[in-house]
């Protein structure tokens, strides 16, 4: 089995997590995709999902989560806006393929949200609704209730030994384990 890897993103309250999950275009383009959180000792919990069948480049907003599935590029974009400390955790993208188990996409995202000061350079996009100008989508195609019964095992972060080109955006602690994310004032 492929070893699950994770990327660590360290952000401040009010900022936006903006990530992508890639998938095999020919196989999963119109499949329903979901964003899940994995809590220690629990089964993954689905927080948001695309419509079924998934619509191309059509943003689906569930609370502070916005999903956009770019069929023609084989990419699911996930944004979590106005982050809160309690959003910290391990996340993953999955593709629903009933009756089979959901297909997990790499990488998993280890999100660490720390306290920030509103209105300072460490803060970002404090207003959820005005930021993206996306009319809230009432997701009629509800997310399937089942979750993967697999045992949740956490792999260590990938080696980032040769990572170069630092992008100076956020004060970081351990650069080898953390993805640097831009601060938008």
């Amino acid at each position: 089995a492929t070893k699950l890897t994770e990327e660590k993103y360290e952000l401040k309250e009010g900022q936006t997590l903006d990530v992508k999950c890639d998938y095999t275009l020919e196989k999963f383009a119109s499949s329903q995709k979901a964003w899940q959180i994995i809590r220690d000792g629990e089964m993954p919990k689905t927080l948001a999902c695309t419509e079924r069948p998934s619509k191309n480049s059509h943003p689906v907003q569930v609370g502070r989560i916005i999903l956009e599935d770019y069929h023609d590029h084989g990419l699911l974009r996930v944004r979590m806006v106005n982050l809160q400390v309690e959003d910290s955790g391990l996340y993953q993208c999955v593709i629903y393929q009933p009756p089979k188990e959901p297909h997990m996409l790499f990488d998993r995202i280890r999100l660490v949200v720390t306290k920030g000061f509103s209105g300072t350079p460490g803060s970002n996009e404090n207003s959820t609704q005005n930021v993206y100008k996306i009319p809230p989508t009432t997701t009629k195609a509800l997310c399937p209730l089942y979750t993967s019964p697999r045992t949740v095992t956490q792999a260590p972060p990938k080696s980032t030994a040769d990572v170069s080109t630092p992008d100076s955006e956020i004060n970081l602690t351990n650069v080898t384990d953390i993805i640097r994310v831009p601060v938008f004032n």
Epitope: E7, D18, V19, E68, K158, S159, A161, F184
Partner: antibody, heavy 122, light 107 residues
């Protein structure tokens, strides 16, 4: 040394295919997307598509769909871009460029190959 | 697709001048904008990412600003080695598109 080294210039006939290689060194190849950008003589930059070297998944713009194939060999840190059914308007310099981390929506290209000139002529 | 319109398409300035190039997006791209410099016969080189962040190793005379649909790229004091074509590029959604370029010459 962090760099992308591309294969040499090619001359092809209309209808043929070309496969351009891009060898990465000095960084972890599987951690960053590889993008392909082309530039016709005296023209601007045109993004063709991307590839995640870790998963092997890729995507391209509608214009090239069905004609472009992006692959990689992780054991030797090489990305490939193959363009088929060549026509004269495909004559251009083809660049590979490193994108952001594979999981990040950061589409900036901070490292470029020198480019490969592909000439399509009968 | 989002269209990126740069202006002017070409300009001529003297060494020491302040040079400004603008990039207009056809829709709101927030700060998802990068600037590149391309010297004749060379590959492009990233100068500014996320609208205003200076890439490592790039001289501080280069700067960027803007948000939404209007962006500005500035060279505070033009140097002879700045002769090049400059491009903006958005990544607010896919496909990624570049501006048509601004060719900068020295008077």
């Amino acid at each position: 040394q962090v760099q992308l080294v591309q294969s040499g210039a090619e001359v092809k006939k209309p209808g043929a295919s070309v496969k351009v290689s891009c060898k990465a060194s000095g960084y972890t190849f599987t951690r960053y997307d590889i993008n392909w950008v082309r530039q016709a003589t005296g023209q601007g930059l045109e993004w063709m598509g991307w590839m995640n070297p870790q998963s092997g998944n890729s995507g391209s713009v509608q214009k090239f769909r069905g004609r472009v194939t992006m692959t990689r060999d992780t054991s030797i840190h090489i990305a490939y871009m193959e363009l088929s059914s060549l026509r004269s308007e495909d004559t251009a310099v083809y660049y590979c460029a490193r994108g952001g981390y594979t999981s990040s929506w950061r589409w900036y290209f901070d490292l470029w190959g020198r480019g490969t000139l592909v000439t399509v002529s009968s | 697709d989002i269209q990126m319109t740069q202006s002017p398409s070409s300009l001529s300035a003297s060494v020491g001048d302040r040079v400004t190039i603008t990039c207009q997006a056809s829709q709101d791209i927030r700060k998802h904008l990068n600037w590149y410099q391309q010297k004749p016969g060379k590959a492009p080189n990233l100068l500014i990412y996320d609208a205003a962040n200076l890439e490592t190793g790039v001289p501080s005379r280069f700067s960027g600003s803007g948000s939404g649909t209007a962006f500005t790229f500035t060279i505070s004091s033009l140097q002879p080695e700045d002769i090049a074509t400059y491009y903006c590029q958005h990544y607010a959604n896919l496909p990624i598109t570049f501006g048509q370029g601004t060719r900068l010459e020295i008077k």
